[in-house]
Interface confidence: low
């Protein structure tokens, strides 16, 4: 209840996260032009990326374009990109939708289609659907430890969500263990009323809300966090212009002294940690 006699102050907060878990993925692996089936192991360094601010990202799905090299090649025949003669292709033109700079030539992409030749990382990325089910669907069982330090400078009071008495092997549960700061990703989605398996395909943004309602008076002191969860992105993927959450990154390597890269379009969940609340003291 609102204590009108108290002086209220908003929380100042810092957050640090640590994700743990191993995923195993069955996928086609291309080695020396030969495609083989392989099981790949993904650890924390493979599926998490450092983000600025109170966020962390877990990759749940991906599309790879392997063995790209900087050269000339036909661009991917996306809608409106096909040509029948050089006239359609403008030398030096950079179409924002294209993956390179046009050379002015119309060249065969395959047996039936021709597209403008581009100077780019080749072969250019194909427009592929995200694999379904998601390749790292087992990320549902990953856990995240959230360390949250808070401060009320006006009241000269500092605390954190992790208590010395906490068990490092606990897992957050709304009823049985509401103060545990280790969260299973699948449980976060369940609490938010969302289906992890479904969101993992295209990616999404999930909010972890930490609410501090602190009474700092010595006679009725209470200052512990309350956790809640909600999805922050537009879940209507069919209707939204760019569904889900994804970005591209590349792994570079040299083969016969030629720089090459593997382009990875990573789909996943960005977790935003939103800390709010007040501290009140007489």
């Amino acid at each position: 209840s609102d204590k009108l006699y108290q002086r209220k102050e908003p929380v100042i907060s810092s957050v640090h996260t640590k994700v743990k878990g191993i995923a195993e993925v069955t996928e086609n692996v291309t080695e020396g032009g030969v495609t083989k089936l392989g099981h790949s192991i993904f650890d924390t360094a493979d599926y998490t990326f450092p983000l600025q601010g109170n966020s962390f990202f877990v990759m749940t799905n991906y599309v790879k374009s392997e063995g790209q090299v900087q050269t000339l090649c036909p661009e991917y025949p996306r809608r409106g990109a096909q040509c029948s003669s050089d006239r359609r292709c403008k030398k030096g033109w950079m179409d924002p939708q294209s993956k390179g700079i046009q050379t002015g030539r119309c060249v065969p992409y395959d047996k039936t289609r021709k597209t403008c030749e581009v100077s780019a990382w080749c072969p250019t990325e194909e427009e592929k659907e995200a694999p379904r089910p998601a390749l790292l669907r087992s990320a549902e069982n990953f856990t995240v430890l959230i360390k949250n330090n808070i401060h009320f400078p006006g009241h000269n009071y500092t605390t954190r969500n992790i208590l010395p008495t906490m068990n490092g092997s606990c897992t957050f549960h709304k009823t049985w263990d509401p103060q545990c700061s280790i969260f299973r990703l699948g449980d976060i989605f369940q609490e938010a009323g969302e289906n992890f398996t479904e969101v993992a395909v295209q990616g999404g943004i999930m909010g972890i809300e930490i609410y501090w309602d602190c009474n700092l008076d010595s006679w009725s002191h209470h200052c512990r966090p309350r956790y809640s969860f909600r999805r922050l992105d537009d879940k209507n993927t069919d209707e939204s212009f760019v569904p889900g959450y994804n970005f591209r990154y590349a792994k570079y390597y040299k083969e016969n002294n030629v720089e090459k890269r593997t382009l990875i379009k990573a789909f996943g969940i960005r977790f935003d940690i939103l800390v709010f609340g007040t501290g009140g003291k007489f």
Epitope: A23, E24, V29, G38, H39
Partner: nanobody
Amino acid sequence: EVQLVESGGGLVQAGGSLRLSCVVSGRTFSAMGWFRQAPGKEREFVATVGWNPMNSYYGDSVKGRFTIFRDNAKNTVYLQMNSLKPEDTAVYYCAGSGSLLDVTSEAVYTDWGQGTQVTVSS
């Protein structure tokens, strides 16, 4: 000493089911696979499962009929064979691989069981 011991083979009518088991001792493998060899034919890939029991892959001829699963606690891999056909008649071998690459190729499997005979009569 590494040992892979298969069991569960036998004679079954077309359309019937069998479950093969393979108990592993002496080593833990990253990938476990089942292969089969019919008389006068080459050894053929059937199915593989990674360390994560959810992670499995099947040969085209058995997709939708066979299920591979793994119990890491018991060091056992199973092959549940449903809707069996006479062309499934073969000796079935269990194999273990320390590698997770190219798991449909028998070359990566370092350790093999003795095999168990499966006969499907029409």
